[in-house]
Each structure stands twice: as C-alpha cells, then as structure tokens.
C-alpha cells in the first residue's frame, strides 16, 4: 500500500479468482484513543472499533472511503483505491490502446517545434467518475523539470455504439534549448482513477521523435503565362523553430484530382515554392517535415486549382 | 525519404553538400544495422544514448545560431580550444566563433572515424560476418574532413589485444550510429545556417 495523495491510498493486488488479497491496517488520524468506530462509504454498519482497523482487501467491495468516528463526529478519512496486477502486468482498463505507432500505445505525444513544449493525449470510453493527474521529467534517475498543466477533455467522438473521449495535456520543459542534442528522454506519467480503480500509464520519448510541424501557411497559386503550369508558394508555419536556415523544413507538393483514385503527382523540395501542372478540378496540397530528421509530416495545407 | 531532393548549387558553401551526403550515409547505415541486428537491442528506445565527444568537443554550443545565443538554456558554456584554420571558411572575415564551430565539427568527425575504423576491424574478425561498416559512410566522413581541412594531430587507431566480444561490439555499433546520426543532423543544420549567412 502506498499514498497517492493526502488520505488517498493505493492497494496493489495480484488479481485472480480466489486471491488472498492484501492485509491493510488503517490508523485513525486523531489523538483520541477510545470510543472510535469505523465505517465504509455511506454505510452506517460498524466495521470495527479502536484506533486501528485491520482489513483484508480482495475486491472492489473492500475499497472505498473508510471513516473513523467518535460520538457521531468524523475524525478522519482514508480512501482506498485498487491497482490490479494481472499475471504480472498492471491493468490498463481505463485508457484505450491507440495502436499507433505500435500496440500498447495508450499515450500519444506531439511537438510542433523544438522549444520543449509538447502535447499528449489519450482516449477512454469512460464518461464519469474519472480523474487524471500528469507528471513529466527529462530523464528518470536525475530528473530535470518539465511542467504540465491539467488534463482536459479535448474531444468527444462517436465510435460505433460507443462514445469515445479524448483528454489532452500540455507540457513545457523548464529549460529547453531548441538546438540541444537530446540524450535523456522525456518521461510522461499519467495517473488515472476511475471510481475505485487506480492505473498508471507512461510514455518515454525524445522531442525530436515526436516533432510534427504545423502545415505550411499562406499557400498561394500564381498562374504562369501561356502555360498550364502554376507556381505554388508557401511559408514556414509560425510555430516552427527559428532560425529557419538552421531548423530547415522540406516539403511535399501534391496535385490531387477530385477522385481519390486519380493518380497523385508528388514533388519534393527544400524551397518554399514549386512549379506544377494544375489540372481542372484538382487541388494542390503542401505538407512539411524536418529536413534533417525524419519525424512526422505535417497535415496538408490545400488550395483548389481553379 | 522516397524522392531525392535536388543537390545544392556548385557555388554554395563548400561543406553543405558533404554534410548532406554524411547524413544520408549514416541514416542508411543505421537503418541497415537495425534490420541486420534485429535480435539485438538496436532501436532508439533500447539503447543507451552515449556521446563519445562529450567533454571533448562542444559542437552544439560552438555552432549555436546567433538567434539562440539569447536563450540561456543554450549557453551551457564549455571551454575548449580548437585549431582555427579551415577551407570551408568562405571569407577572411569569418568570425572566430565560426572557426571554432567548424574545428569542433572536424574533431567530432575525427573521433567517430577512429571509433568506426576500430570497430570495423573487430567486426571483420566475427565468424558470423553479420555486419560491417559501409565503406561509403567512411569515405563521406573522410571527404567532409578534407573539405573542412583542419590541421590536427592524427589520432592513432585503437588496437585491442583481447578477443573481441562480438555481441558487445554490435551493440556498441548501434549506440555509435545513433549518436553519430544525431551529430550529423546538427552538422547539417549548422552548414545550412552558415550557407544562408
């Protein structure tokens, strides 16, 4: 058993049918010695008396808020949560496996640049009695500071019969140098509590591996005289690291017909303009990627050909 | 990347082309190592990230773009002295900082070159003959060093008398390639920045 926060304790259980569970001793936080009784949650049934209460915690029915009283007055509370270990592996019931980029990906994180700021998000089908708390650091043995905000509900989607909820959090490395070569990964730890179930999820990454630039901005077309060709131009996104000559991007320009089946023409360039043939009813899209370290491509920025 | 990007103009800053070749070569070599050594811990998540140039050179600091010198987190100053003459310096007006930066890059390349050559000698003794260093990568390191053209003491190739542990050597190769790829990215950024300046 360990303390998650004041008066909230996590009991770790080897989770299998008929498991013996864990013996837990609760102590009433009071100078009183006599006349103390214990109850669980809203029940008035007296579980025991005395300054300490010994319980065998096996299932969720044994978890909850234990309260010690004296003469009708509440002295203190202890909330017991359960953390299930199933065949040596901690349970992952609360969050959905996003399966991207690989199986068992519960937390996904992205950064728009090298400033040390990043966003993480996760999915769940649970709508109520759910709380998250996020901590982060650079490295784990001698951790350097990363400050995270509060996790907030950022999107709701309907998936088949289920509603899916997306939560996200923004974090900022306290002293980040955009040009630094990372040797210690960022660690992100999310504590999730649903009713009386506790789970924790972690992700470890280098900022360089989670970079996803914003789409190029100011995408414009300029028709070339006496030609079906157009000059496409764009600019670096405002959120990208500067100077751009150091943090350079490479671009992919795509001409896409109205039908998804039509052949796509693609050109790769390091410049912020390109000449392409603009077909009727087609659209031109441009996306960006770090020129020197192949992390994710940005989303497409698009303009119609007409 | 699927399609090649156009090569730089001949009139460009001389080292840019070489540094782009270097990044391509080390990335290819790392990909080959990850595939060939699939049963070894060779992915970025599995290896220890070690920098053999740590406390010996200070490329990131010496090559910091002017715009980032205002960022206190970037000014992790380490005093290192370098030889300051090089042929990549486009004009006589080149600042002392730029010379320091390029000589630091030269020292990095020299250190990695020695490590890679020593390692290749060991890998050639492996009866499994599983993986060797790409000669193209070694040649590209050499070309960039020549383009930088710094006079520097030659570092003798390390020789080892004991029987090599091939498992450890292959893991060290992965560590070295990951670190060298990261340094090659920095070198490319620096050359691109200097070229634009």
């Amino acid at each position: 058993i360990w303390e998650l926060k004041k008066d909230v304790y996590v009991v770790e259980l080897d989770w299998y049918p008929d498991a013996p569970g864990e013996m837990v001793v609760l102590t009433c936080d009071t100078p009183e010695e006599d006349g103390i009784t214990w109850t669980l949650d809203q029940s008035s049934e007296v579980l025991g008396s005395g300054k300490t209460l010994t319980i065998q915690v096996k299932e969720f029915g044994d978890a909850g808020q234990y309260t010690c009283h004296k003469g009708g007055e509440v002295l203190s509370h202890s909330l017991l949560l359960l953390h299930k270990k199933e065949d040596g592996i901690w349970s992952t019931d609360i969050l959905k496996d996003q399966k991207e980029p690989k199986n068992k990906t519960f937390l996904r994180c992205e950064a728009k640049n090298y400033s040390g700021r990043f966003t993480c998000w996760w999915l769940t089908t649970i709508s109520t009695d759910l709380t998250f708390s996020v901590k982060s650091s650079r490295g784990s043995s001698d951790p350097q500071g990363v400050t995270c905000g509060a996790a907030t509900l950022s999107a709701e989607r309907v998936r088949g019969d289920n509603k899916e909820y997306e939560y996200s959090v923004e974090c900022q490395e306290d002293s980040a140098c955009p040009a630094a070569e990372e040797s210690l990964p960022i660690e992100v730890m999310v504590d999730a509590v649903h009713k009386l179930k506790y789970e924790n999820y972690t992700s470890s990454f280098f900022i360089r591996d989670i970079i996803k630039p914003d789409p190029p901005k100011n995408l414009q077309l300029k028709p070339l005289k006496n030609s079906r060709q157009v000059e496409v131009s764009w600019e670096y996104p405002d959120t990208w690291s500067t100077p751009h000559s150091y943090f350079s991007l490479t671009f992919c320009v795509q001409v896409q017909g109205k039908s998804k089946r039509e052949k796509k023409d693609r050109v790769f360039t390091d410049k912020t303009s390109a000449t392409v043939i603009c077909r009727k009813n087609a659209s031109i899209s441009v996306r960006a990627q770090d020129r020197y370290y192949s992390s994710s491509w940005s989303e497409w920025a698009s303009v119609p050909c007409s | 990347r699927n399609l090649p990007v156009a090569t730089p103009d001949p009139g460009m800053f001389p080292c840019l082309h070489h540094s782009q070749n270097l990044l391509r070569a080390v990335s290819n070599m790392l990909q080959k190592a990850r595939q060939t050594l699939e049963f070894y811990p060779c992915t970025s998540e599995e290896i220890d990230h070690e920098d053999i140039t740590k406390d010996k050179t200070s490329t990131v600091e010496a090559c910091l773009p002017l715009e980032l010198t205002k960022n206190e987190s970037c000014l992790n100053s380490r005093e290192t002295s370098f030889i300051t003459n090089g042929s990549c310096l486009a004009s006589r007006k080149t600042s002392f900082m730029m010379a320091l930066c390029l000589s630091s890059i030269y020292e990095d390349l020299k250190m990695y070159q020695v490590e890679f050559k020593t390692m290749n000698a060991k890998l050639l003794m492996d009866p499994k003959r599983q993986i060797f260093l790409d000669q193209n990568m070694l040649a590209v390191i050499d070309e960039l060093m020549q383009a930088l053209n710094f006079n520097s003491e030659t570092v003798p190739q390390k020789s080892s008398l004991e029987e090599p542990d091939f498992y450890k050597t292959k893991i060290k190769l992965c560590i070295l390639l990951h670190a060298f790829r990261i340094r090659a990215v920095t070198i490319d950024r620096v050359m691109s920045y200097l070229n634009a300046s």
């Epitope: 008929d18 019931d93 | 049963f39």
Partner: antibody, heavy 115, light 112 residues
Framework: QVQLVQSGGGVVQPGRSLRLSCAAS????????MHWVRQAPGKGLEWVAF????????YYADSVKGRFTISRDNSKNTLYLQMKSLRAEDTAVYYC????????WGQGTMVTVSS | SYVLTQPPSVSGTPGQRVTISCSGG????????VKWYQQLPGTAPKLLIY???QRPSGVPDRFSGSKSGTSASLAITGVQAEDEADYYC????????????FGTGTKVTVLG
C-alpha cells in the same frame, strides 16, 4: 471453490457452426478476464481468444480471426465461444481459463470437425 | 506458430535432476514473466510455476523455475515416476498481450 464447467462440444461438418459454453462459479466472474485455449490431438497448447472482465475488449489468434467470437454474460456467469466456418484444423480439445498469475482451467470439451 | 522453443523430449531416472529450457526473444520472455504447466494425459494443464520462479501452494518443492534474459527453465530435482507428463512454458509478447504464448511442449519420460 473456483469451478469452470464446459459444454457444447461435439462432431460437426466443415463450414458449420458450434457454440461452446463455460459456466463459472465460486468467484466474482464479472471481475476477471477469460481465455479460450485449444489443443489439437497429439499437439501443443494454442491460445484462441481473450475477453476483458466487462466484455469491452476482445482479442483473437490470427488462425480464428473473423470466424470465432468470444463473448460473456456476466449476469449468467458464463463465457462463450461461437465458432463459424469450422475447418478440419479446428479439431481440438477446447479449454476455458481464467486470466491471472494463478489460473483455473475448465475440464475441456472436444470439438471434431469432420465430413 | 510457436515463438517459445522447448526441447521435444527429456528423460531421466528416478531421483535425477531434469531441466527443460524455454527459449524466446526480447519482446516476450525478455520483457514478461514466465509460467510453467504440467499436463497429464487426458487432463487440463496444471500450473506449476508462475512469475518465473514462484510455486503455487500444493506444488512440490522439487519443481523450480528460473529466467535469464530471453530464456527460462524448469528444473525437477529428484524426478519421480508421477512427473512423467508434458510440460509447457507460457509467456506474453509485449506487443500482443493479453494473447498467451505457449512453448512447443516437452515430454518428460522417467526411465526404469
């Protein structure tokens, strides 16, 4: 006393369907994940499928994906395996088992796919 | 397709020490716990070892398990006639958990 009692096995023609049941008692069935494991005659153990305690997630072996469906009725304390488009290679003894460091197995039920 | 490899058979005379190996990889045994089962003819498998080296109550102490790197092994010290059975190791793969990965199985024969 944890008990898993299986039923539903038998002889079936290729292409036909069969549903296996596993009735649980002696524990809070709705709190635990459950597996199906099979063993072809004279062969080793092969995992077939898993279902979470609340039925929210199901996982299948590639060899049965799209043909077999694992399900549970927590109000009846019963686990099911619906098998469709049966093939000769599905012939095996099928076991249900609890998920956890200590597990309990059903007695097994024989499924024979033969024309 | 079995990813955990066991020898098809091992044998020993009563009282001898018999060991069965179970060889896997970094993503399964290398990063997960191992169980061992005993299966007597016509019966369901019985758990012998869980968590690499833990014995459930009721399992004789002549059975012991260990794990090192990407391999595990089961030892029977002082093998007895009633130990003649099939033995299976089981683990998980970190990418496909909770799918169970079973070993190929080993037939233990007690001679004499």
């Amino acid at each position: 006393q944890v008990q898993l009692v299986q039923s539903g096995g038998g002889v079936v023609q290729p292409g036909r369907s069969l549903r296996l049941s596993c009735a649980a008692s002696g524990f809070t069935f709705s709190s635990y994940g459950m597996h199906w494991v099979r063993q072809a005659p004279g062969k080793g153990l092969e995992w077939v499928a898993f279902i979470r305690y609340d039925g929210s997630n199901k996982y299948y072996a590639d060899s049965v994906k799209g043909r077999f469906t694992i399900s549970r009725d927590n109000s009846k304390n019963t686990l099911y395996l619906q098998m469709k488009s049966l093939r000769a290679e599905d012939t095996a003894v099928y076991y249900c088992k609890t998920h956890g460091s200590h597990d309990n197995w059903g007695q097994g039920t024989m499924v024979t796919v033969s024309s | 397709s079995y990813v955990l490899t066991q020898p098809p058979s091992v044998s020993g005379t009563p009282g001898q020490r018999v060991t069965i190996s179970c060889s896997g990889g970094r993503s399964n045994i290398g990063s997960n716990r191992v169980k061992w089962y005993q299966q007597l003819p016509g019966t369901a498998p019985k758990l012998l070892i869980y968590g690499n080296d833990q014995r459930p109550s009721g399992v004789p102490d002549r059975f012991s398990g260990s794990k090192s790197g990407t391999s595990a092994s089961l030892a029977i010290t002082g093998v007895q006639a009633e130990d003649e059975a099939d033995y299976y190791c089981q683990s998980y793969d970190r990418g496909t958990h909770p799918a169970l990965l079973f070993g190929t199985g080993t037939k233990v024969t007690v001679l004499g």
